[in-house]
């Protein structure tokens, strides 16, 4: 028997520095977690103690903090090289800055293989990119070899900016021939490493003949055996065992997100490459693990540029951006409109001639808007200003919901109206009319939504049975502010870009902004 230790991360989302327990900015260092310096300490400790170790990343290193905004992926290559990752799968967010934003900072600089079997380059891009990532890589480990085959969510064209010259194929269809290739090369220990979410990870384990282990990402799934060490609630045991169609027991793992945990899986193979046993657990990277001094020093050196960036002008406003709770928790506010417009703009993807865009709607809890921006400071807007408006380090995500769920969400928005509560929704691509004289749960009297399958966008009444795409904060997707119906009834959820980054990019693009209050949210006469 031969034992392999798989260390794995996924959805790190530019958390290079240690964070608080909820993966936001570290405030009290003695209670902070994660970060590459701490990760390096644990990885090195395991490498010294165990003979056959692989360090793998299942994608979405890109996007999530000011680190990515400023360094645009160079920080990912630099620190992943420093940690000596053995392989990485491409995630959807690796395409956020287009293909060029992947090629130059990461693909050309990484000293480890970057993998995806289901992304096929065509046209002029083929010669430029296809040698820079691979479908699989055979890695010598100790006296054996292990094949790693990569995959990426086929939804990436709807979630990011891969352009028109990359085709995202079905994961299972694309993986099978690559695994077969590895089999022709007599590689009999094969790990599928990828970024399509836990449901697809399980399907790959079930359907792709020859895959021994699946290491996944995208869905931020937390698996744990025993008593979990922090706030995350396990979605199942670690590893999650799937019985494949050909009768094998295939371990599937994921390690939550944001570098808070290091996945730790021990696999025992027999001499024919069959998995005999698998066990492990994610390791919580808390303050009991010291930060490596040399990596920490490097982080501090890179940090300097971030502090300078925070105070630079992104663009100008010529109007007061009303982000006060007195406005945004009671009525349509222009800060809410600005943020929603930025959220939609960030999700412009012309992937189908029938649609002007794949999504037209935005909802945003008014309680998530934490500050106004005064235009009387020469109109200047900085990252620092936006960090006061959106201080929680969240993301603006894409969900699919039935019309009936949206209707419930808008009823919840005003179910206790008047108490300055955070659930009051700001909107984009939606016209809503409330009648507050009616009883809670029956106050939405009109709800029109902007069409997507149209050449000239116009507002049509919401259909209860239709499925709609909506951009919203991850806080709402996770049922925050009492929006349990969203969490319980959503049909799909893909995590998006960092909230501040979305708004800052929009402001930089527009240069000068003047959002208005324009009748997106109305109250019927006599009720307000």
């Amino acid at each position: 028997a031969w034992e392999l230790t798989i260390l794995h991360t996924n959805d790190v989302h530019s958390r290079l520095e240690q964070t608080s327990e909820d993966s936001s900015k570290c405030v009290n260092a003695s209670r902070c977690m994660g970060g590459v310096a701490r990760l390096f300490t644990k990885v090195q400790q395991i490498r010294r103690a165990e003979p056959n170790v692989l360090l793998l990343d299942a994608g979405d290193q890109y996007q999530g903090t000011i680190w990515f905004t400023v360094y645009k992926g160079a920080e990912v290559a630099h620190f992943m090289n420093a940690l000596r990752y053995d392989a990485m799968a491409l995630g959807n967010h690796e395409f956020d800055n287009g293909v060029e934003g992947l090629i130059e900072p990461l693909l050309k600089e990484a000293k480890f293989p970057i993998l995806s079997a289901n992304i096929k380059a065509k046209g002029p891009l083929a010669s430029q990119i296809s040698g820079l990532y691979l479908p699989y890589k055979v890695l010598p480990v100790g006296d054996e070899v292990v094949g790693i085959v990569g995959y990426t969510s086929k939804e990436t064209p709807f979630l990011s900016n891969p352009g028109t010259n990359l085709v995202f194929e079905d994961e299972i269809t694309a993986l099978q021939p690559e695994v077969d290739k590895l089999k022709t090369l007599n590689v009999n220990k094969i790990i599928a490493l990828g970024h399509s979410g836990f449901e697809m990870d399980k399907l790959i384990a079930q359907k792709v003949r020859g895959v021994d282990v699946v290491v996944g990402g995208h869905s931020n799934t937390f698996l744990y055996t025993g008593n979990p060490p922090s706030k995350e609630v396990p979605a199942g045991k670690y590893p999650f065992i799937v019985t494949s169609d050909d009768g094998r027991k295939v371990p599937v793992v994921q390690a939550y997100a944001f570098g808070k945990y290091l996945g730790y899986l021990k696999i025992e193979f027999d001499e024919r490459g069959n998995v005999i046993s698998s066990h492990g657990n994610p390791i919580l990277l808390n303050s009991s693990i010291p930060e490596d001094p040399s990596i920490k020093a490097d982080i501090n050196k890179w940090r300097i540029k971030l502090d300078n960036y925070s105070t630079q002008e992104l663009g100008k406003t010529i109007v007061y951006l009303d982000g006060s709770s007195q406005s945004c928790r009671f009525r349509e506010c222009n800060m809410g409109n600005l943020i929603c417009d930025a959220m939609i703009n960030n999700n412009l993807r012309h992937t189908d001639e029938m649609f002007w865009n794949h999504v037209s709607m935005c909802i945003l809890n008014g309680g998530g808007i934490r500050s106004p921006i005064d235009e009387r400071n020469n109109g200047t807007i900085t990252w620092e200003n936006l960090a006061a408006v959106l201080p929680f380090g969240g993301t603006f995500d894409l969900v699919q919901l039935k019309g009936s769920t949206l209707k419930k969400a808008f009823e919840h928005s005003v179910h206790r109206y008047g108490q300055s509560t955070g659930e009051f929704l700001q909107v984009g691509g939606i016209h809503v009319v409330y009648d507050l004289s009616r009883k809670p749960g029956d106050r939405v009297v009109k709800l029109d939504v902007l069409c997507t399958k149209c050449r000239v966008p116009s507002y049509d009444p919401l259909k209860m049975d239709e499925v709609y795409k909506v951009i919203l904060p991850n806080f709402l997707a996770n049922g925050g502010d009492g929006f349990q119906m969203i969490k319980d009834e959503l049909l799909r959820h893909d995590s998006g870009d960092q909230d501040i980054n979305v708004v800052s990019t929009y402001i930089s693009k527009m240069k000068v902004i003047y959002p208005a209050v324009e009748g997106r949210i109305k109250f019927s006469t006599g009720s307000h």
Partner: antibody
């Protein structure tokens, strides 16, 4: 330093079997890599014949499948080629090499085998 | 099987010149491609792996490029020791196949 050395008869009669030995020094053939036979015909054309892996599995070129066998003796750190039913078309310089899923980094110096009556 | 086609079959050049050899694969092989040099009466020496990575001790005047189905080996400022036969080879699954070779001769 890793070295590979081919040995065997330089002349084989048609219809007989060709047998060659590759002796490896500086690296154990049970460690990690694949151990290949490659031949080069008089016109310089190269053909990969097959390999034996560190864990004793074989992979042969389909064009030779019914005639070829690659085995090993781990105690001597050697691996062997046997090619049955040879014809004059099998006249070539035979090389052993280390590689497999990656390119052939280490080669023997080659041994010329002529198939002739 | 994946066929590897090399061009030109032979090439005459002078010391100091720059030459490029092309290798075409019959199917997409990503960057699972190697280049070798063979001198008269000797075995092959690995020059480039993964289409572009120079082997250890290989002079920087050699460079590999390309991916998918089209690959190139470029030799800048030819030196007397560069003359010989060059081969490409894919290792994207088995059977591994070689190009027919390009004989680089002194003009």
């Amino acid at each position: 330093d890793i070295q590979l050395q081919e040995s065997g008869p330089g002349l084989v009669k048609p219809s007989q079997s060709l047998s060659l030995t590759c002796s490896v020094t500086g690296y154990s053939i049970t460690s990690r890599y694949y151990w290949n036979w490659i031949r080069q015909f008089p016109g310089n054309k190269l053909e990969w014949m097959g390999y034996i892996t560190y864990d004793d599995n074989n992979n042969y070129n389909p064009s030779l499948k019914n005639r070829i066998s690659i085995t090993r003796d781990t105690s001597k750190n050697q691996f062997f080629l046997k090619l049955n039913s040879v014809t004059p078309e099998d006249t070539a310089t035979y090389y052993c090499a280390r590689g497999g899923w990656d390119p052939f980094l280490y080669w023997g110096q080659g041994t010329l085998v002529t198939v002739s009556a | 099987d994946i066929q590897m086609t090399q061009s030109p079959a032979s090439l005459s050049a002078s010391v100091g010149e720059t030459v490029t050899i092309t290798c075409r694969a019959s199917d997409n092989i990503y960057s699972y491609l190697a280049w070798y040099q063979q001198k008269q009466g000797k075995s092959l020496q690995l020059l480039v792996d993964s289409a572009k990575n120079l082997g250890e001790g290989v002079p920087s005047r050699f460079s590999g490029s390309g991916s998918g189905t089209q690959f190139y080996l470029k030799i800048n400022s030819l030196q007397p020791e560069d003359f010989g036969v060059y081969y490409c080879q894919h290792y994207y699954g088995t059977p591994f196949t070689f190009g027919g070779g390009t004989k680089l001769e002194l003009k």
